[in-house]
Interface confidence: medium
């Protein structure tokens, strides 16, 4: 989002021969921030603290285990995606505090706000990879015994990252800084040069590939997994169901406002009241999506506590327990406890 529109008061300069309205305060930087922006700042601050510390801890725990444990490889990659995105938060925070003024230059404008989209695509693709792994463990245990290894897992992660980078390119390319006079500031946003078709195409691709298609496939995937799990009377199936639902749902819940407002804005005229309202909510939607970057460690800890009864262990050892248990393929096609539990933890970051 963050699309430039050339008729809104926020982006008013002279495209429509605007001049300064002397009845309104000039120096908007002295005005109070809008409520959605204040909420966004609060969310950004919390996400940054929890996301950086939590994901750093997850990286630390899983990095040592990644050589021998496939689950550790999945969680390591998810944590890296989240951690990377969190690094952009201080800059985004500063920009909102300055009423969206962007003093950081064109390169930073292209890269930093694109990190959340890279995170979205990397996370959903990694989640899809993890889900495929879970699916194969349940339905193709013999194949897993023969072929499921760390090398293949790393290749799958590399493919996911590569695709995520490709899918982020449009946002990266269309992101520019633009100078404004009223009020004086430099803005960072997406500029489609009045090409509504192109803007819609990008929004639709993002909605379909980053949300609707994963929602459909993961829902089907986990429906099959859970049905098989229940039919085999696997242990802790209720808890597993709850955690899996929490895991997958968190991605879709936190990305929903961003995706909905993004697709609506691409179809609305920039001068329409609905567009102007959505524009004001833009930062809040981005910050809400950013919650994905800190939710994983929280889910891991909550899940770990659930499986341990209560928090008796240190945080690292609790996380190690949750993230690095290897799935064992048994002759019977029923899930092992470790398989169910680890899947149950968090197979997403998106």
């Amino acid at each position: 989002m963050d699309s430039f529109n050339y008729t809104t008061p926020d982006y008013g300069h002279y495209d429509d021969k605007d001049t300064l309205d002397l009845n309104t305060p000039v120096d908007k930087t002295s005005n109070t921030l809008r409520v959605p922006d204040i909420l966004a700042l609060v969310i950004f601050a919390v996400v940054f603290l929890v996301g950086v510390l939590g994901n750093a801890l997850v990286v630390w725990v899983t990095a040592f285990e990644a050589k021998r444990t496939i689950n550790a490889i999945w969680f390591l990659n998810l944590a890296v995606a989240d951690f990377l995105s969190c690094l952009a938060l201080p800059i985004l925070f500063t920009s909102i505090v300055q009423h969206h003024h962007w003093p950081f230059g064109g390169a930073a404008c292209s890269i930093l706000p694109s990190l959340i989209l890279l995170n979205m695509y990397a996370s959903i693709l990694l989640l899809a990879t993890i889900s495929a792994d879970r699916f194969l463990l349940v339905f193709k245990p013999i194949w897993c015994q023969n072929f499921r290894g760390a090398g293949l897992a790393w290749i799958a992660c590399a493919v996911a990252w590569g695709l995520a980078l490709l899918l982020t390119i449009p946002s990266f390319l269309y992101r520019v800084v633009r100078e404004e006079y009223f009020p004086p500031k430099v803005l960072c946003g997406v500029d489609y040069s009045h090409d509504k078709r192109r803007e819609r195409a990008v929004a639709i691709v993002r909605l379909v590939l980053g949300f609707l298609w994963p929602l459909l496939t993961l829902t089907i995937c986990y429906t099959f997994i859970l049905l098989r799990t229940w039919s085999r009377r696997a242990t802790r199936s209720t808890k597993t169901l709850k955690v899996v639902v929490a895991v997958v749902a968190s991605f879709f819940i936190f990305w929903l406002p961003y995706q909905v407002t993004g697709i609506m804005m691409s179809f609305l005229e920039p001068s329409s009241p609905t567009f102007l309202l959505l524009k004001k909510l833009d930062s809040l939607c981005v910050s809400f999506a950013y919650i994905n970057c800190c939710i994983n460690p929280i889910i891991y800890v909550v899940a770990g506590q659930g499986f341990q009864g209560r928090l008796r262990k240190s945080l690292p050892s609790l996380l190690r327990n949750v993230l690095t248990e290897e799935s064992v393929v048994r002759e019977s096609k029923s899930f092992t406890r470790s398989t169910v539990d680890t899947m149950a933890q968090k197979t997403q970051a998106v």
């Epitope: 300069h13 495209d15 300064l20 002397l22 305060p25 003093p103 800084v177 100078e179 006079y181």
Partner: antibody, heavy 117, light 107 residues
């Protein structure tokens, strides 16, 4: 570093037109407004107009609007100002500037236009 | 058009002296005012924008202030390179308009 380069001088006959250039380098040309100013010998500064290269959006001083045309060539990162129907009143130094609503502004050295038969 | 009345039109001062130039706007322009310096060789430099904000490369001896419709540029301690022409410029509405200029000369 950011630079705006203007040719030193242009000599034209009355009634003719002149197209002066302002070559920008060292920054994202399409992101910043280019402003044009005029200064007649021994006199003060006068604003001619400005252009946003990312869009070609222009604003003019009504005094010169009918005779001044601001354009850009984004491929060569150059802004142009064309003045038509020149008279001796148009003999002046013309400056281009990346005004910069925040942070630094950058200025060309000016092009001296002499209108003489 | 907004008229900008700049005073004085010329000023003689000594090195190390403190000087102030003023500009009055005929209409409200809030903080949309800049101060420009033009050296004898014609080169122009913006010193102040948004009435009070100093450009990053400009020495701290320059400062801008405003009260109502009156705007001031103050040089706390004159140095030899400060002797030049100074213009105020409003950019609150079209067309942008300049003050008549102040010629600052060595006494």
């Amino acid at each position: 570093q950011v630079q705006l380069q203007q040719p030193g001088a242009e000599f034209v006959k009355p009634g003719a037109s002149v197209k002066m250039s302002c070559k920008a380098s060292g920054y994202s040309f399409t992101s910043y407004w280019i402003t044009w100013l005029k200064q007649r010998p021994g006199q003060g500064l006068e604003w001619i107009g400005d252009i946003y290269p990312g869009r070609g959006t222009t604003d003019y001083n009504e005094k010169l609007k009918s005779r001044a045309t601001l354009t850009v060539d984004t491929s060569s990162t150059t802004a142009y100002m064309q003045l038509s129907s020149l008279t001796s009143e148009d003999s002046a130094v013309y400056y281009c500037a990346r005004w910069g609503t925040t942070g630094r502004s950058y200025w060309g050295q000016g092009t001296t236009v002499t209108v003489s038969s | 058009d907004i008229q900008m009345t700049q005073s004085p039109s010329s000023l003689s001062a000594s090195l190390g002296e403190r000087v102030s130039l003023t500009c009055r706007a005929s209409q409200e322009i809030k903080t949309y005012l800049s101060w420009l310096q033009q050296k004898p060789d014609g080169t122009i430099k913006r010193l102040i924008y948004a009435a009070t904000t100093l450009e990053s490369v400009v020495p701290k001896r320059f400062s801008g202030s405003w009260s109502g419709s009156e705007y001031s540029l103050t040089i706390s301690s004159l140095e030899s390179e400060d002797f030049a022409d100074y213009y105020c410029l409003q950019y609150a509405s079209y067309p942008w308009t300049f003050g008549g200029g102040t010629k600052l000369e060595i006494k």
